[in-house]
């Protein structure tokens, strides 16, 4: 297993609709034809997998059916969007990139993106 550098933004603020997007960029040492991207969430020293996708020559990442993630790729950049976030989902979201093929296998883990989610205030009742 060889190490690889992965860069991602330090902080992202989710939209009022609970959507957060960020770019995960990896320094590929060669021309990988099969790449696996995993988003991990670290909160209270616990790490859980949020979503994962394996992609090849296309620019659309395909996630499992119940995934809250969507994404596209362009070169060595992956544009990730996480949906359905609530305040309790605030945490550090880590991008993990694996170059699956061809050998050798490379693994890179980013420093994480702190995603802040603020639940929208309920609209006050209006007389109008």
């Amino acid at each position: 297993c060889k190490a690889m550098h992965v860069a991602q933004p330090a902080v992202v603020l989710a939209s009022s609709r609970g959507i957060a997007s960020f770019v995960c960029e990896y320094a590929s040492p060669g021309k990988a034809t099969e790449v696996r991207v995993t988003v991990l969430r670290q909160a209270d020293s616990q790490v859980t997998e949020v979503c994962a996708a394996t992609y090849m020559m296309g620019n659309e990442l395909t996630f499992l059916d119940d995934s809250i993630c969507t994404g596209t790729s362009s070169g060595n950049q992956v544009n990730l969007t996480i949906q359905g976030l609530r305040a309790m989902d605030t945490g550090l979201y880590i991008c993990k990139v694996e170059l699956m093929y061809p050998p050798p296998y490379y693994l890179g883990i980013g420093n994480g993106t702190q995603i802040y989610v603020i639940d929208p205030e309920p609209c006050p009742d209006s007389d109008f």
Epitope: T33, M56, G58, N59, F63, T70, T72, M100
Partner: antibody
């Protein structure tokens, strides 16, 4: 040029198993998914699953779990689908298609399950 | 799984006319892709990533849309466009196709 060539049409009895092949040429085999698609007579398209030829990574439509198994032999740039415990409902045309974009398809193999 | 609903299921058009086929997804998808299938042949990639024409596809075909609602338009229908058209999503597994729209050119 890119070409996908499938095995010939097949007639089998219920309960039997079958292997269909998809021979790829004209491109780097390990750089693209191979997808398998089922089409029953007069019906639409159903995605069965896909395999990454380099690593062997597979994704399946749950509807075909236990029915279909995807494999590849990279040395011969050939992908295979193994269909088991065949029933009349498995009678269909089976296609293989290349990559994320399904940009090249083979001509299709007609599988007929009949007693 | 994401269900793609195409409408209409069958339609008829005259040469030179304009037709629009719609594809509605049960939940938002990143892109929609379109295929054309003529009787007895394999499907052919027509449009990918919602609006990009595949190689060799005539400019009279176009695609548009976002979120859950997409469409395929043929601006000037020709006799050779008689076929069944399928939309497809690749945002989540399993990959799914719409039920198809059969276009008859009279």
């Amino acid at each position: 040029q890119v070409h996908l060539q499938q095995s010939g049409d097949v007639l089998v009895k219920p309960g039997a198993s079958v292997n269909l092949s998809c021979k790829a040429s004209g491109y780097t085999f390990t750089s693209y998914w191979i997808n398998w698609i089922k089409q029953r007579p007069g019906q639409g398209l159903e995605w069965i699953g896909r395999i990454a030829p380099g690593s062997g990574t597979t994704y399946y439509n749950e509807m075909f779990t236990g029915k279909a198994t995807l494999t590849v032999v990279t040395s011969s740039t050939t992908a295979y689908i193994h269909l088991s415990s065949l029933s009349f409902e498995d009678s269909a045309v089976y296609f293989c298609a290349r990559g994320d974009y399904f940009d090249y398809w083979d001509q299709g193999t007609t599988l007929t399950v009949s007693s | 799984q994401i269900v793609l609903t195409q409408s209409p299921a069958i339609m008829s058009a005259s040469p030179g006319g304009k037709v629009t086929i719609t594809c509605s997804a049960s939940k938002s998808v990143s892109y929609i892709h379109w295929f054309q299938q003529k009787p007895g042949t394999s499907p052919k990639l027509l449009i990918y990533d919602t609006s990009t024409l595949a190689s060799g596809v005539p400019a009279r075909f176009s695609g548009s849309g976002s979120g859950p609602s997409y469409s395929l338009t043929i601006s000037r229908v020709e006799a050779e466009d008689a076929a069944t058209y399928y939309c497809q999503q690749r945002t989540t597994y399993p990959l799914t196709f719409g039920g198809g729209t059969k276009l008859e050119v009279r």
